[in-house]
C-alpha cells in the first residue's frame, strides 16, 4: 500500500524520495510519473534525471532538494484537485533488476 501525503489546493505538494549515491556526484537515473510504477520505468513521466542533471520536466514539477546528494523529492507547485492520485518515484540503480520503486499517494484538500 502507498504512503499518503497531503496538501491543500493552491499550495505546493512535497513527495519525498531519496537514495544514497555510491559516491558524491555518482548519480543514477530517476523518473517520476503520475500513476503507479509500471514494470519498468515510469508511466506519464513528469520529471526525470540522468547521471548528470534533470533532463526532462513538465511545468509545476521540480526537485527542490539537492538531487546530486540523492534527494530526488518532488515538489508540485500550486496544486489542484486534479493532482490527487498515485505518483511513482523510480530509482534506476544499474544492474540486474536493481530498481528501487516507491508509490506515493497524494491527497489534495
Amino acid at each position: 500500500s502507498e504512503v499518503e501525503y497531503r496538501a491543500e489546493v493552491g499550495q505546493n505538494a512535497y513527495l519525498p524520495c531519496f537514495y544514497t549515491p555510491a559516491a558524491p556526484g555518482n548519480l543514477v537515473p530517476v523518473c517520476w510519473g503520475k500513476g503507479a510504477c509500471p514494470v519498468f520505468e515510469c508511466g506519464n513521466v513528469v520529471l526525470r534525471t540522468d547521471e548528470r542533471d534533470v533532463n526532462y520536466w513538465t511545468s509545476r514539477y521540480w526537485l527542490n532538494g539537492d538531487f546530486r546528494k540523492g534527494d530526488v523529492s518532488l515538489t508540485i507547485e500550486n496544486v489542484t484537485l486534479a493532482d490527487s492520485g498515485i505518483y511513482c518515484c523510480r530509482i534506476q540503480i544499474p544492474g540486474i533488476m536493481n530498481d528501487e520503486k516507491f508509490n506515493l499517494k497524494l491527497v489534495i484538500k
Partner: antibody
Framework: QVQLQESGGGLVKPGGSLKLSCAAS????????MSWVRQTPDKRLEWVAT????????YYPDSVKDRFTISRDNAKNTLYLQMSSLKSEDTAMYYC??????????????WGQGTMVTVSS | DIVMTQSPSFLSASVGDRVTITCKAS??????VAWYQQRPGKAPKPLIY???TRHTGVPSRFSGSGSGTEFTLTISSLQPEDFATYFC?????????FGGGTKLELK
Amino acid sequence: QVQLQESGGGLVKPGGSLKLSCAASGFTFSSYYMSWVRQTPDKRLEWVATISNSGGSTYYPDSVKDRFTISRDNAKNTLYLQMSSLKSEDTAMYYCARDPYYTNYVPMDYWGQGTMVTVSS
Amino acid sequence: DIVMTQSPSFLSASVGDRVTITCKASQYVDTYVAWYQQRPGKAPKPLIYSASTRHTGVPSRFSGSGSGTEFTLTISSLQPEDFATYFCAQYSSSPLTFGGGTKLELK
C-alpha cells in the same frame, strides 16, 4: 521507417549456447529500452528480457535469469541475447522489440520478424 | 506472477460484426494493459496501450477499455484483415505477462 532484424537462431543441443542479434534502423536506438519476447510452439508469448537505453539496467523473468544475458551496443545499433544452459522449453521464435519510455513507458511498439531457436538432441 | 486470462480462446464472426475480447488479470494492474494483433506467420503488431490508447495508425474501429482487473478489446465492425489472433499483456509488475490469445476466425 523502423526496422528490427533478428539473426542467430538455429538448432542447438540441450545444455548448449546461442547468441541472438537484433539489428535496428530507422530510429535513434540509444533512446529506447529494448526487449526480447519469445513465442513457443503452442503460440504463447513470453517476455524474456529487457534492457535500458544505456544498457545499465537489465530485467529478466525467473525462467531465464542466470541463463540468459541481454546486452546492447549503441554504437552498432544492435541488441543481443546470449543464451546458455539451453533447455527444450526454450524452443521458440525469438522476437526483439522496441520499448519507448521517455515520456511514458509503452511496451513493445515495434517488433522484428523473429528468429527460430530449436533446442533438441 | 500475474495471470492474464483471455476469453474466448476462439471466436467465429463475420465481416461487419462487432466483437469483444476480454482479459482478466489475477491481480490489480491499474491500466497497464496492452493489446496486440498477430496474423499468421507475422510478428505481433501493437494495437492498444494504457488499456485504451490506440497506437499511431491503428484504425478507430479498435478500442480498448477497463482498469483494475478486467479489460476488453472491441472491434466495432470487422474487416477482412482483422481475422487474426489477439493477445493482451500486463506491464504493471514483473514478470510482464501475456494472455493466451484469442483466435478470431471467419464464420
